[in-house]
């Protein structure tokens, strides 16, 4: 705590410039307006202040806003934001996406730090929804953002957003979080014809049913093995292999390669030998004819 | 949410033909396969007609076969069944349904009208 | 066509019993097999796709299984809105069918 001392005589601060990085702490706190400096917030960032200096002038902006700091400030807070805790930032009310925008650039080129979790968190409670345009700047400065949320949180991202998602917004996302984001994506994309949705669709498919996957195998899509392997087990299992075929095209001899990964392994295992032997690609496992099919849980309890 | 209403049903001589309506709202109908199953009074389900979301592909048990046509209509939201040369033994409350998946003919979904019943009888 | 059969036709059962329903087809159809629930006067309803996959909002008491050409469906502890007919149906091969029909009444 800077204690209160009287500004020395013609050191009163009429605006904030240059000659204050020149000021003690102590000079700081005492010929600083509090009042000044929230008008005048913008100079700041241009001020080569010391880390010590922001600490003074934090905390004059503290005591004049124990409530948390209007979105005037913030948006204005530059490098200073830097200087906030989380508990600092839970008392705001940033509403507006040029503020969002405006710190989220303090932060660029580093891993999300626990201030930025907690704006961001904050905006879009606010927001109420993850909308288009905050997913769109939230993707560009993080592009893992997506990932990083819970399911829970996941579901208030309205398809309408899910137009703003890249392939690689979605690279470290699990199966749980594909499987929220797959209804909300196939429902944003269902108005585009056959063949323009399944590209916009792919990098969702994670989180696809078997349903879905038995129509793709109708659209003739040559689906990659790289999508292939994310996709569900469970979806994947009743898929015959004429269906994969289908979905893979010219990419189905890429199977013999994953034959020991799931879900290939475990798709194999379901499928009647003479039926992968069409396939000409050597595919070992199947059921031979005649034999009875355990029920995958008696497998699981038998392995 | 989503609705699908059938209606074109009622009493038809032998021989005679029909053409059965079903309106859908509530999704994206030119995305969907659809669907037309019957039941006949007392009876089970028996899948009748299908067809492909933008009606490039049908296909037909092999009752109503050279018999029934299923079309639709994707400006307007509509599934048709025009049955001709009608038999007693199609007398039967006719369900439309939409396709669990889009883009493709894939299973039933949960999604079904009430149904229309139409009795073939002199 | 692929021919379903189920059994038994029809079963009278107490509130909280089990009750087990079986479809066997004529033919091998992998998991193409789904399982409906119709009750009095209204639609058929979706409760179990694919053999094993819950649809839905359906509630954790109705579970499939089996592969290939031998199918289950069970209700474990059945109540009151459960009285229904259950049909199995594939979609393996066109055409669709479906089985008889299996008529579950509440003693």
């Known amino acids: 705590e800077v204690e209160k001392t009287a500004c020395p005589s013609g050191k009163k601060a009429r605006e904030i410039d240059e000659s204050l990085i020149f000021y003690k702490k102590w000079e700081l706190e005492a010929c600083v307006d509090a009042a000044l400096l929230a008008t005048q917030m913008d100079r700041v960032n241009a001020i080569p202040f010391t880390y010590e200096q922001l600490d003074v002038l934090k905390h004059k902006l503290d005591e004049l806003y124990p409530q948390g700091y209007p979105e005037s400030v913030i948006q204005h807070l530059g490098y200073l934001f830097l200087k906030m805790s989380p508990e600092d930032i839970r008392k705001w009310n940033v509403t507006s996406l040029e503020t969002l925008k405006a710190l989220l650039e303090v932060n660029k080129g580093h891993e999300m730090s626990p201030q930025v979790a907690t704006l961001i968190d904050r905006f879009v409670k606010g927001r109420g929804q993850l909308d288009k345009d905050t997913l769109d700047t939230l993707t560009a400065f993080y592009p893992g953002y997506l990932c990083s949320l819970s399911p829970e949180e996941l579901s208030s991202v309205p398809p309408s957003s899910i137009w703003a998602v890249r392939p690689q917004d979605l690279d470290t996302c699990d199966p749980r979080q594909l499987d929220v984001l797959y209804p909300k994506a196939r429902l944003a994309f269902q108005n585009m014809n056959g063949s323009e949705y399944f590209v916009k669709i792919q990098s969702f498919l994670g989180g696809a049913p078997t349903e879905d996957l038995k129509a793709l195998s109708q659209q003739n899509v040559s689906m990659d093995l790289a999508t292939f392997m994310k996709l569900r087990t469970d979806a994947v299992l009743p898929l015959t292999v004429a269906e994969v075929q289908k979905l893979l095209g010219p990419h189905v001899e890429g199977l013999k390669a994953e034959e020991r990964h799931r879900p290939v392994r475990d798709w194999i295992l379901r499928q009647r030998q003479d039926d992968l032997d069409t396939l000409g690609l050597g595919l070992q496992g199947g059921i031979p004819n005649g034999y009875l099919v355990l029920d995958l849980s008696m497998q699981e309890a038998l392995s | 949410q989503v609705q699908l209403v059938e209606s074109g049903g009622g009493v038809v001589q032998p021989g005679r033909s029909l053409r059965l309506s079903c309106a859908a709202s509530?999704?994206?109908?030119?995305?969907?396969?659809m669907h037309w199953v019957r039941q006949a009074p007392g009876k089970g389900l028996e899948w009748v007609a299908a067809?492909?979301?933008?009606?490039?592909?049908?296909y037909y048990a092999d009752s109503v076969k050279g018999r029934f046509t299923i079309s639709r209509d994707n400006s307007k939201n509509m599934l048709y069944l025009q049955m001709n040369s009608l038999r007693a033994e199609d007398t039967a409350v006719y369900y439309c349904?939409?396709?669990?998946?889009?883009?493709?003919?894939?299973?039933?979904?949960?999604?079904w009208g009430q149904g229309t019943l139409v009795t073939v009888s002199s | 066509e692929i021919v379903l059969t189920q059994s038994p036709d029809f079963q009278s059962v107490t509130p909280k019993e089990k009750v087990t329903i079986t479809c066997r087809a004529s033919?091998?159809?992998?998991?193409?097999l789904h399982w409906y629930q119709q009750t009095p006067d209204q639609s058929p309803k979706l409760l179990i796709k694919?053999?094993?996959q819950s649809f839905s909002g359906v509630p954790s008491r109705f579970s499939g299984s089996g592969s290939g050409t031998d199918f289950t469906l069970t209700i474990n502890s059945l109540e009151a809105e459960d009285a229904a007919t259950y049909y199995c149906?594939?979609?393996?091969?066109?055409?669709?069918?479906f089985g008889q029909g299996t008529k579950v009444e509440i003693k």
């Open positions: 349904a939409r396709d669990l998946s889009i883009f493709g003919v894939v299973i039933l979904s949960d999604y």
């Open positions: 509530g999704f994206t109908f030119s995305s969907y396969g």
């Open positions: 067809i492909w979301y933008d009606g490039s592909n049908k």
């Open positions: 033919q091998y159809i992998g998991s193409n």
């Open positions: 694919y053999a094993s």
């Open positions: 149906h594939q979609s393996s091969s066109l055409p669709w069918t």
